[in-house]
């Protein structure tokens, strides 16, 4: 029949789960630049992957348009809080698209972890969660920011991360 | 034509939502055991199933290769706080694999809930979820840890849960 | 061959992602009630979408039946808390089935946030993230609620919101 | 075998000062907080305030704030309340007890109680 | 603060016999299933006894004659059967909110 090509295409992407765009990127000792920039991500060791979509400067940039379920986790800690700090973390995800200058706010949370110091100690952890669908065009990014960054616990890139798949 | 049989698998698998491999497991009476372990969980009744994934012992197990979406939530809670108790509470995935001895970090939260009690009352709550994209291999395992795990309040299976679905 | 209709149309899904299901709906000034209902969400503009779902008075109905991953977060705030609040504020989705005259709990948090303000400020924010996989058959719905619902933050449907998509 | 072992009965005039002591031992010192009560002659328990023995942070029922000061020593498992401008109205037992998370906050173990009596 | 409601403040039951106890608390003092009760057990010169936790746990080495139950606002203390040694009196504490507050004590005397 004439369906060959295709037909091979088509069991071959069944197979492979279709390649659906996937990412996981991990929190690394470079992610935080103080730059008042986006977090940057490591995208090949350890638990870091790409599959069918591109990383540049700390943003995943879809290759293939669509809806796509985007996460993050952020790790905060600390012992007290800086001072001036307000009382507000943000952690959000944005979207970079050529065809407007600004980031797009997509999902975005704050809260004030500072006054979760236990009775044992100034010592405090919180921890923050996005995840949603949202619809990229191909060549349109998204970036992790946090403010403040100084508040960002790293280790071994587990605790915080970003990542995304297609829906 | 020749693709016959195989047609007529992608057309099923295709009305089947491809069988994709997903799952979502419950908090039940059973899942503290107090003995260091992981948490174990409901996998039939009520809003608890598996489809495409196995399960053992606490963990779900990946019976075809392929990134996976796996996400764990759980309802902490207390009157007070033990002393003794780091001012953490670690929630968090962790993998199993033939290929090396011990569990391996995927995904973790650390936490400090117990500063948290409003004006007079010591109750407090707090929940703490996860979720990233993981690459398991056939076999390979995924467990739930909470250290301290006195502090998960267990209910009827909305507020701690544990589940996968692949991307 | 006799399969040129279904050829086209699994090719067809193919290039479309399958149609599969999908929806991000965002918080609006008219989610929050005050009537003991859900919230409620906007559908269209900005970030918002519904594909292969619809949307009644608050809920996500599901036009297919299958394992859908349902999310939503929502932004808690407030200066101090309201008196006579108890410490707990619960943030669940819920289902609604012809076959069931009551709500069904689904994926539930409870949080006491209002202890959370840092020692300069009585302000306080905190976020509340459920996601999980449930079953839906067609034209059962999922809504969102919160109580104390006085304390979620709309803004610009960034840090409130809910959705889902087949899995 | 856990001990809370209290310091002996006080004689003090009224305007002075008096600190108890309790001793501890039998169990990690660090590990539960310590909790002070007052039992007035023939009457009931008043629950006074606690200390965190691991940094010393005191929480104090609010009638008994500008009362009592307390204070731990890590070295030596001891716990100790300060008692300050003393009136016949702080005559009483003072007892302190060991606070038990994993049984609801409740008092398990219980020091055999110091006498304080204030008199001119 | 949370007013612990004690009565009988005094009873006198037989040997062998049940002793009730009953303990109202002004509001609930309950947390996810537990009720956050405590009951104790005083001797004239002596410190008070541990004898329930959590509104219905047995602390180690209390005799099972002794129980207890309630949940909410309302709990009672249970001895039964009634020995010699019982005789004492017993507080109820909620341990659920500051301050930690007591019944004003109910004296159980034997027959």
């Known amino acids: 029949d004439g369906h060959g090509g295709s037909w091979e295409q088509l069991i071959q992407e069944r197979r492979s789960h279709q390649n659906n765009p996937a990412a996981h990127l991990t929190g690394a000792n470079s992610s935080l630049t103080g730059s008042g920039g986006p977090l940057l991500w490591e995208t090949q060791l350890g638990l870091a992957f790409l599959r069918g979509l591109d990383y540049h400067d700390g943003a995943l940039v879809a290759n293939k348009a669509g809806y796509y379920y985007i996460y993050s986790k952020v790790q905060l800690g600390g012992v007290g809080c800086p001072l001036g700090l307000a009382s507000t973390i943000t952690h959000g995800l944005y979207k970079r698209t050529p065809r407007y200058p600004e980031e797009l706010e997509l999902l975005v949370s704050q809260q004030s972890p500072c006054g979760r110091a236990t009775s044992n100690s100034r010592v405090w952890w919180d921890s923050s969660f996005l995840g949603g669908v949202v619809h990229l065009e191909v060549g349109e990014e998204v970036v992790v920011r946090v403010l403040d960054e100084r508040l960002v616990r790293l280790r071994d890139g587990t605790r915080s991360y970003f990542g995304a798949f297609m829906v | 034509d020749g693709h016959g049989g195989s047609w007529e698998q992608l057309i099923q698998e295709r009305r089947s939502h491809q069988n994709n491999p997903a799952a979502h497991l419950t908090g039940a009476n059973s899942s503290l055991t107090g003995s260091g372990g992981p948490l174990l969980w409901e996998t039939q009744l009520g809003l608890a199933f598996l489809r495409g994934l196995d399960y053992h012992d606490g963990a779900l197990v990946a019976n075809k290769a392929g990134y996976y979406y796996i996400y764990s939530k759980v309802q902490l809670g207390g009157v007070g706080c033990p002393l003794g108790l780091a001012s953490t509470i670690t929630h968090g995935l962790y993998k199993r694999t033939p290929r090396y001895p011990e569990e391996l970090e995927l995904l973790v939260s650390q936490q400090s809930p117990c500063g948290r009690a409003t004006s007079n009352s010591r109750v407090w709550w707090d929940s703490s979820f996860l979720g990233g994209v993981v690459h398991l291999e056939v076999g390979e395992e995924v467990v739930v840890r909470v250290l301290d795990e006195r502090l998960v309040r267990l209910r009827d299976g909305t507020r701690s849960y544990f589940g996968a679905f692949m991307v | 061959d006799g399969h040129g209709g279904s050829w086209e149309q699994l090719i067809q899904e193919r290039r479309s992602h399958q149609n599969n299901p999908a929806a991000h709906l965002t918080g609006a000034n008219s989610s929050l009630t005050g009537s003991g209902g859900p919230l409620l969400w906007e559908t269209q503009l900005g970030l918002a979408f519904l594909r292969g779902l619809d949307y009644h008075d608050g809920a996500l109905v599901a036009n297919k039946a299958g394992y859908y991953y349902i999310y939503s977060k929502v932004q808690l705030g407030g200066v101090g808390c309201p008196l006579g609040l108890a410490s707990t504020i619960t943030h669940g989705l819920y289902k609604r089935t012809p076959r069931y005259p009551e709500e069904l709990e689904l994926l539930v948090s409870q949080q006491s946030p209002c202890g959370r303000a840092t020692s300069n400020s009585r302000v306080w924010w905190d976020s509340s993230f459920l996601g999980g996989v449930v079953h839906l058959e067609v034209g059962e719905e999922v809504v969102v609620r919160v109580l104390d619902e006085r304390l979620v933050r709309l803004r610009d449907g960034t840090r409130s919101y809910f959705g889902a998509f087949m899995v | 075998e856990v001990k809370l072992e209290e310091s002996g009965a006080e004689l003090v005039k009224p305007g002075a000062s008096v600190r108890l002591s309790c001793k501890t031992s039998?169990?990690?010192?660090?590990?539960?907080?310590v909790y002070w009560v007052k039992q007035r002659p023939g009457q009931g328990l008043e629950w006074i305030g606690e200390?965190?023995?691991?940094?010393?942070?005191?929480n104090f029922n609010e009638k008994f704030k500008s009362k009592a000061t307390l204070t731990v020593d890590k070295s030596s498992s001891t716990a100790y309340m300060h008692l300050s401008s003393l009136t016949s109205e702080d005559s009483a037992v003072y007892y302190c007890?060991?606070?038990?998370?994993?049984?609801?906050?409740?008092?398990?173990?219980w020091g055999q109680g110091t006498s304080v009596t204030v008199s001119s | 603060d949370i007013v612990m409601t004690q009565s009988p403040a005094s009873l006198a039951v037989s040997l062998g016999q049940r002793a009730t106890i009953s303990c109202k608390a002004s509001?609930?003092?309950?947390?996810?299933?537990?009720?956050?009760m405590n009951w104790y057990q005083q001797k004239p010169g002596q410190p008070p006894k541990l004898l329930i936790y959590k509104a219905s746990h047995l602390d180690s080495g209390i005799p099972a004659r002794f129980s207890a139950s309630g949940s909410g606002t309302d709990f009672t203390l249970n001895i039964h059967p009634v020995e010699e040694e019982d005789a004492a009196t017993y507080y109820c504490?909620?341990?659920?909110?500051?301050?930690?507050?007591f019944g004003s004590g109910t004296k159980l005397e034997i027959k």
């Open positions: 039998g169990y990690t010192f660090t590990n539960y907080y």
């Open positions: 007890t060991r606070s038990n998370w994993d049984y609801g906050n409740a008092m398990d173990f």
């Open positions: 200390i965190n023995p691991t940094n010393g942070d005191p």
């Open positions: 504490q909620q341990s659920i909110e500051d301050p930690f507050t």
């Open positions: 509001q609930s003092v309950d947390f996810d299933g537990d009720g956050y």
